[in-house]
Amino acid sequence: HTAAQDNCTCPTNKMTVCSPDGPGGRCQCRALGSGVAVDCSTLTSECLLLKARMSAPKNARTLVRPNEHALVDNDGLYDPDCDPEGRFKARQCNQTSVCWCVNSVGVRRTDKGDLSLRCDELVRTHHILIDLRHRPTAGAFNHSDLDAELRRLFRERYRLHPKFVAAVHYEQPTIQIELRQNTSQKAAGDVDIGDAAYYFERDVKGESLFQGRGGLDLRVRGEPLQVERTLIYYLDEIPPKFSMKRLT
């Protein structure tokens, strides 16, 4: 995207400040909150987006637990620490020196502790289940048409490699989209499933992160698919470590 055009903007992230000060007068965009330069040809990492969002906080996300190892984002929004690549740092702390460990999508996966808490590595969320309920329609969507459109959406709007959309399940009115991406599968330049899920979640809530006025327009054979609730389940490569007290 070049500054020679009237609109020096970031198509994939509206939470940026852009100016024509890149190499050769190119449009360069920096994330709000962190000032980190972002690549506007792909999705911005969720960590940088959350950091930007803290300047105008909205309702926190709520996640539900599908099994013993799934995580619930009970903590809502926080101002995260991101590494130079924009990923969540494994250990997050607040201003009162309370610390906890997070996974690659920034959800807490340990009890809270103090500054002595160690988080040895950023544990990867390798399986995401997006559970949707769509608004009533004249009839059920054709499953194969729905599958094709949702795969197309993740492939083309969110730029996720097709192999990472593992399955699309449908039992009217519930749609489930399974995203799977192991550490070994993710190549340089691949969109992270966590970032794709976050963009999708914001889209279906009418809070699109993309530049422009359009928002998500999802249709199956011309019929609008309107989502009335979204639940996202995260499963990590290593199960979370919570004390028994929390689980009772």
């Epitope: 903007t9 198509p11 506007c40 330049g189 993309f210 530049q211 006025r213 249709r219």
Partner: antibody, heavy 121, light 107 residues
Amino acid sequence: QVQLVESGGGVVQPGRSLRVSCAASGFIFSTYGMHWVRQAPGKGLEWVAVIWYDGSNEDYVDSVKGRFTISRDNSKNTLYLQMNSLRGEDTAVYYCARGGYNSGWWAFDVWGQGTLVTVSS
Amino acid sequence: DIQMTQSPSSLSASVGDRVTITCRASQGISHFLAWYQQKPGKVPKLLIYAASTLQSGVPSRFSGSGSGTDFTLTISSLQPEDVATYYCQKFNSAPLTFGGGTKVEIK
């Protein structure tokens, strides 16, 4: 069926202007990024411009920046390319092509039949 | 801007031969590469997107591979109807540059 039909090509003198159009049918036009691609006689394909599904973003190849403008009217299912200050090297068949779903950047799965623009005095 | 270099620029092979065309990006483009076929006097046709995904309706003798900077289009068994010029194209971001093309002929 899914179809793109270009129109508006013709012979034009250097320095003059021309607008070509592309009428879309058979799909939800407003949900797709759209592109113009051109092919000079006997030459390869050259991408010219993109406009996102909602008109929020445009991009151009360097050689046409400041001279060509891509636009769309989603209510009319029509894509446009306004070409000003035309040069001899703009002589080509101009194709419109469908790009990404709710996006601009993707491969082109639907192409029009093309319209020939000849810039000559 | 990222340059796309295709090789060879032309080739001649016999019916039934395995044909390989390569495309190299001057910088990494992940899997954002497409292959098109353009028969003489016809409109280009999408064969492969996302480097290796076959477009619906395209014969399975066509396949694509690669990621990052090096990509390959393979025709496993060349058929007379495959005579055409083949183009690669990057679509990670603008400009969506095409390669110079590879003209495939039958011996």
